[in-house]
Interface confidence: low
């Protein structure tokens, strides 16, 4: 399919690099529209003038940050994963909510609760959720700390989810935990408020169980008090989900090729 | 680029399936020899008569078991990973070794030590190691148990490595932990005996720290005693490494294409 | 997915994983691999229609795009997606060796 | 690896990742994607010589095999190995949306 062009790649059929680039560009035009399930570019008639809203930019930047830290392995991509995922975020319930009252006294843990009605507004059906990440902004940390994440399970029990070894650091850094399964469960259940606990890792021998790491949104040194929340940077859930209307479209065309 | 041909694959140059199969078979001939860095099939003149030795078959079966449980994702394959890896195994040091004496009394942990001279015999240089797995045969388990694996670090301290949530089960099952980094460290250091600890996960609240799971090789109910070892099925390290002579060959041809 | 479950049970004409069992003795004339006697190597075959060009009605191709050219390649190609390793036993002189060969078995394919 | 570090700094003629920056406005004529303005899509290009046939001297090809036809394909093909997603911001009516598109950026290639 190829023809020679100056000093370009030598191939058994020498390659026209420009043609390949052009074909790739045209394929990307199709790929983007197809991933968004758009038959043509959306009309820009109603787009409000001026820059993008702050919150949208913050969300876009959160998503970009995730990408930057992501391993670049190609995963096999089921059909549902091929299509674009809408990204939303749900901030942690503010700490003056009564749910926090019974968890005030611990030095080894901090607690983060989320309003499931906000989650359901963002993701109306559990099956639509393709990824949920709990994002925490950790402030500087003087010593290495091993932390564990738990999910609130029943009345007063907690289920272990995952752990992380945090290296000492002079600068703030976002931590991200994959909590897709947990959020999917929450969306399936009737509860109003659900939560996580971040704890120091307690080994069976050691008795030094203090959570040393400072998470933005919880006043340093008074973790038991759970005071001032620093705006947009308090813990949040970053959600990636197939929009409902796109999912319905997918369902109706579930035939193969 | 494709054109139809009865019920065969539709292609523009209709596909001769037999030709493609033949080409794939020839390519596999090259692939296998190339992965083993053999210029031609090895001579069979000195092969001893009779079946394969028991130990070799056990090792082959261990490797096959690993494959069966392995996720079938293609990983990006650096040059060193393209070539075949020799598989060996090193059994845990028998429990009458004095190293175990100081770890007798714990109900929340079992200990597994390995002779580094045996490891070095199998893998002469740390860089040759491409994977090390700690394999444990867990016997039936009545209740769910959350276990943690630690590495012996300094005199009496242990470094957390990973954890596993074990579901109840009526039949024995191999557990596998990736300990490549740890074994690479051991190969780099001068120690004679190195070890792991498998412990119950201890949360900061809960005080029920008993290790419920039975690991083959440790007498049930008397974990503190660490008595009879059941032959080949006691814990072992499964090692995958580039043979030294193949590695030297690789080093000398480290130019690109 | 274009995997063995789907492809081996269908008459899919486009990109799919195809069955291929290799018997070391019969197909390669080799007696030196002692275990296994052969293996299911499989292979990928079938067209990946480009299906996106400026004269195609956008709406018609959307549903097909993700299978035929999900990577938006200039010339999509039917290639392995999921691969598995193969352990073998052979002798070097009198010494038996167990070696693992990476990425030998094709489990599924994709247009890339 | 045939990644951006190696390929962008070499004159590799065989399979490699090639630079391609797409400016949504200039290259696609699109003004509807508000962020980003464009992205490094890149693409895979270059031959994967077959390099194994019965009349080839075995020993000569061993060193090359793992790059030219590591998957032992009947017709090896230069395709993406590592891919990354792309988040975008666009409007549907008056409502801004942030969406993530999977597998949009080619970071490295392989012969498969």
């Amino acid at each position: 399919d190829y023809k020679d062009d100056d000093d370009k790649l030598s191939t058994s059929k020498t390659i026209d690099m420009e043609l390949v680039k052009r074909k790739r560009i045209e394929a990307i035009r199709g790929q983007i529209l197809s991933k968004l399930r758009l038959a043509s570019p959306p009309s820009q008639g109603e787009v409000p003038p001026g820059p993008l809203p702050e919150a949208v930019l913050a969300l876009y930047n959160s998503t970009r940050d995730r990408v930057a830290g992501e391993s670049a392995e190609p995963e096999p991509e089921p059909e549902a994963d091929y299509y674009a995922k809408e990204v939303t975020r749900v901030l942690m319930v503010e700490t003056h909510n009564e749910i926090y009252d019974k968890f005030k006294q611990s030095t080894h843990s901090i607690y983060m609760f989320f309003n499931t009605s906000e989650l359901r507004e963002a993701v109306p059906e559990p099956v639509l959720l393709s990824r949920a990440e709990l994002r925490l902004l950790r402030l500087k940390l003087k010593v290495e700390q091993h932390v564990e994440l738990y999910q609130k399970y029943s009345n007063n029990s907690w289920r272990y989810l995952s752990n992380r070894l945090l290296a000492p650091s002079d600068s703030p850094e976002w931590l991200s935990f994959d909590v897709t399964g947990v959020v999917r469960q929450w969306l399936s259940r009737g509860g109003e408020i659900e939560g996580f606990r971040l704890s120091a890792h307690c080994s069976c021998d050691s008795r030094d169980n203090t959570l040393q790491v400072d998470i933005n949104g919880f006043t340093t040194g008074r973790r038991g008090d759970l005071a001032t929340i620093h705006g947009m940077n308090r813990p949040f859930l970053l959600l990636m989900a197939t929009p409902l209307e796109r999912a319905q479209h997918l369902q109706s065309s579930r035939h193969r090729r | 680029d494709y054109k139809d041909d009865d019920d065969k694959l539709s292609t523009s140059k209709t596909i001769d399936m037999e030709l493609v199969k033949r080409k794939r078979i020839e390519a596999i001939r090259g692939q296998i020899l190339s992965k083993l860095r053999l210029a031609s099939p090895p001579s069979q003149g000195e092969v001893p008569p009779g079946p394969l030795p028991e130990a070799v078959l056990a090792l082959y079966n261990s490797t096959r078991d690993r494959v069966a449980g392995e996720s079938a994702e293609p990983e990006p394959e650096p040059e060193a990973d393209y070539y075949a890896k020799e598989v060996t195994r090193v059994l845990m040091v028998e429990t009458h070794n004095e190293i175990y004496d100081k770890f007798k009394q714990s109900t929340h942990s079992i200990y597994m030590f390995f002779n580094t001279s045996e490891l070095r015999e199998a893998v002469p240089e740390p860089v040759l190691l491409s994977r090390a797995e700690l394999r444990l045969l867990r016997l039936k388990l009545k209740v769910e148990q959350h276990v943690e694996l630690y590495q012996k670090y300094s005199n009496n301290s242990w470094r957390y490595l990973s954890n596993r949530l074990l579901a109840p089960s009526d039949s024995p099952e191999w557990l596998s932990f990736d300990v490549t980094g740890v074994v690479r460290q051991w190969l780099s250091r001068g120690g004679e005996i190195e070890g792991f600890r498998l412990s119950a996960h201890c949360s900061c609240d809960s005080r029920d720290n008993t290790l419920q799971v039975d690991i083959n090789g440790f007498t049930t109910g008397r974990r503190g005693d660490l008595a009879t070892i059941h032959g080949m099925n006691r814990p072992f390290l499964l090692l995958m490494a580039t043979p030294l002579e193949r590695a030297q060959h690789l080093q000398s041809s480290r130019h690109r294409r | 997915a274009l995997d063995t479950n789907y492809c081996f049970s269908s008459t899919e004409k486009n990109c799919c994983v195809r069955q291929l069992y290799i018997d070391f003795r019969k197909d390669l004339g080799w007696k030196w691999i002692h275990e296994p006697k052969g293996y299911h190597a499989n292979f990928c075959l079938g067209p990946c229609p480009y299906i996106w060009s400026l004269d195609t009605q956008y709406s018609k191709v959307l549903a097909l795009y993700n299978q035929h050219n999900p990577g938006a390649s200039a010339a999509p190609c039917c290639v392995p997606q999921a691969l598995e390793p193969l352990p073998i036993v052979y002798y070097v002189g009198r010494k038996p060796k167990v070696e693992q060969l990476s990425n030998m078995i094709v489990r599924s394919c994709k247009c890339s | 690896a045939l990644d951006t570090n190696y390929c962008f700094s070499s004159t590799e003629k065989n399979c490699c990742v090639r630079q391609l920056y797409i400016d949504f406005r200039k290259d696609l004529g699109w003004k509807w994607i508000h962020e980003p303005k464009g992205y490094h899509a890149n693409f895979c290009l270059g031959p994967c010589p077959y390099i194994w046939s019965l009349d080839t001297q075995y020993s000569k090809v061993l060193a090359l095999y793992n790059q030219h036809n590591p998957g032992a394909s009947a017709a090896p093909c230069c395709v993406p190995q590592a891919l990354e997603p792309l988040p975008i911001v666009y409007y549907v009516g008056r409502k801004p949306k942030v969406e993530q598109l999977s597998n949009m950026i080619v970071r490295s290639c392989k012969c498969s």
Partner: antibody, heavy 122, light 108 residues
Amino acid sequence: QVQLVESGGGVVQPGRSLRLSCAASGFTFSSEAMNWIRQPPGKGLEWIGYIYTSGTTYRANWARGRFTISRDNSKNTLYLQMNSLRAEDTAVYYCARGTHIYDHYYWVHHLWGQGTLVTVSS
Amino acid sequence: DIQMTQSPSSLSASVGDRVTITCQASQSISTYLAWYQQKPGQPPKLLIYAASTLESGVPSRFSGSGSGTDFTLTISSLQPEDFATYYCQSYSDGDSVGFGQGTKVEIK
């Protein structure tokens, strides 16, 4: 004002080379894809090729061996290098800028220069 | 490469006439077609793109139609300034940028 001015034309012998220039003004040249088109005397228009902002060029099949398109954004100038010229290359050579309309960006020629005449003759 | 065939190659008409010029592509180009007007000694001027979209500033007596392979340029009521040569151009991608041979519209 917005304009394109071609220069560098003239009489040249067969087999020789010539470089045409196109000076752009009144718009942000570095942001535009640019085209070369020619018109032999008394005949129709022939598209030669275009260059995007990044410097990547696309050319008509017939132009690939002998014609090279380049640009110098710092000088707001587009170039056409023509080698091994033949009598049939005699034409008025135009540079043109693409339009800004969605999906019709590169090759719909919205703004044209006045052209420069190249005569290949011995 | 795509070939563009215009017909007729020339035509004579009077002021006020309705004039139709056709253009045929050797393969489908969707609606990726433009029409240009060229007067002697001047560069071409864009009239229509996307087969039927009028370029701004072009009088509404000019219209275009068609898709796929067959296209038409119509001048509903010919004016004195419309006597010129008209070219169609395909542009579905860089491989298929091509002009028709032109149609000369002369005064009858």
